[in-house]
């Protein structure tokens, strides 16, 4: 049995997969912040988690996915105000009783030290210093991400 949050996450990811492929992103667009091979957009308004997920989708991006502790620290270094919380793309899967990223992968328990409970309708937020489990209905800011396309030396066949 999937929760409404899980269904929303799956639906949005599937609709994103159906959209037409766009050319790779070589530079971060204006208003987006580059962090290594990603472009981040920190929201200015607040929303519950599923609305935040949907907003990123409308911007042809996704809620932030954090690969490891190092990336978490670099992201947190961009947050100047200690009091502000941001949703990321991680929520509790009731069916699998585990934290699940919106790309379908599960959280490696060593990656994030989460403060709070792992239970139904829990979603993950980050602040300048910590990672929190919050009710997904809580209205806070969020972070969208776009992946930059790595520049490779391409060999083109003769035309």
């Amino acid at each position: 049995q999937k929760s409404s949050i899980e269904k929303c996450s799956v639906d949005i990811q599937q609709s994103r997969n159906k959209t037409t492929e766009r050319p790779g992103l070589l530079n971060c667009p204006i208003y987006w912040q580059q962090l290594r091979e990603k472009c981040l957009l920190f929201s200015h308004t607040v929303n519950p988690w599923n609305n935040s997920l949907a907003d990123c989708s409308t911007k042809e991006s996704s809620l932030l996915l954090i690969r490891d502790k190092d990336e978490l620290i670099h992201t947190q270094n961009l947050i100047r105000d200690k009091a502000i919380l941001f949703w990321i793309g991680l929520n509790f899967s009731l069916s699998e009783k585990n934290w699940k990223w919106i790309n379908g992968s599960f959280l490696n328990s060593n990656d994030l030290e989460i403060r709070g409970d792992a239970k139904e309708n829990s979603c993950i937020s980050i602040s300048q210093t910590s990672v929190y489990s919050e009710y997904c209905s809580t209205e806070i800011r969020w972070i969208c991400q776009k992946e930059l396309t790595p520049v490779r030396n391409k060999v083109y066949p003769d035309s």
Epitope: R22, L25, P29, I30, Y31, Q33, L41, F42, H44, T45, T58, K59, E60, S61, L78, I79, R80, D81, I84, K146
Partner: antibody
Amino acid sequence: QVQLQESGPGLVKPSETLSLTCTVSGGSISSYYWSWIRQPPGKGLEWIGYIYYIGSTNYNPSLKSRVTISGDTSKNQFSLKLTSVTAADTAVYYCARDRMGALDYWGQGTLVTVSS
Amino acid sequence: DIVMTQTPLSSPVTLGQPASISCRSSQSLVHSDGNTYLSWLQQRPGQPPRLLIYKISNRFSGVPDRFSGSGAGTDFTLIISRVEAEDVGVYYCMQAAQFPTFGGGTKVEIK
């Protein structure tokens, strides 16, 4: 209602640094982007740059080597520094709130003259 | 840079009649997030600019409904359906698909 007010010297000598401050009331600079725009007398508008509420900045490439924009959330202010000024930098300088391409609230502007 | 070209340079209009201002960009203004960041500003004599329209056609709060915006891609239009005396001033289009740039301005005056 968000209000912005520019302040700083109205006269700057050539080769010196122009420094202006924008004080924001009725809203926090801990949201949105905060821009500086200038308008030479009788001419059009030129975007100088913005500061993002997380602290990062973006500048007009033509001015990038001379511009610094910084913010102070405790005072709800953001500032512009433009180095090595010439007469071509004489303009009315405006600060504005930028809601991703919508410059929705503007200061009244302050005229800065570059002259010896 | 994206170059914004406005026409006409000057538009003398009769009170109560419509006015139309065109703005053309040197490349598409569709941002990589799918939005088109094209706005219109009004600058009355001796005043700072004032936002009228953002994202092509959205009227900013408090802007009279006689102002409307339209367009797509590289061609955009601001229409004042019935010009009033308070509409006199210079109108600028502005893009923010890349670093923001403004059109040269169109002066609206009463005949």
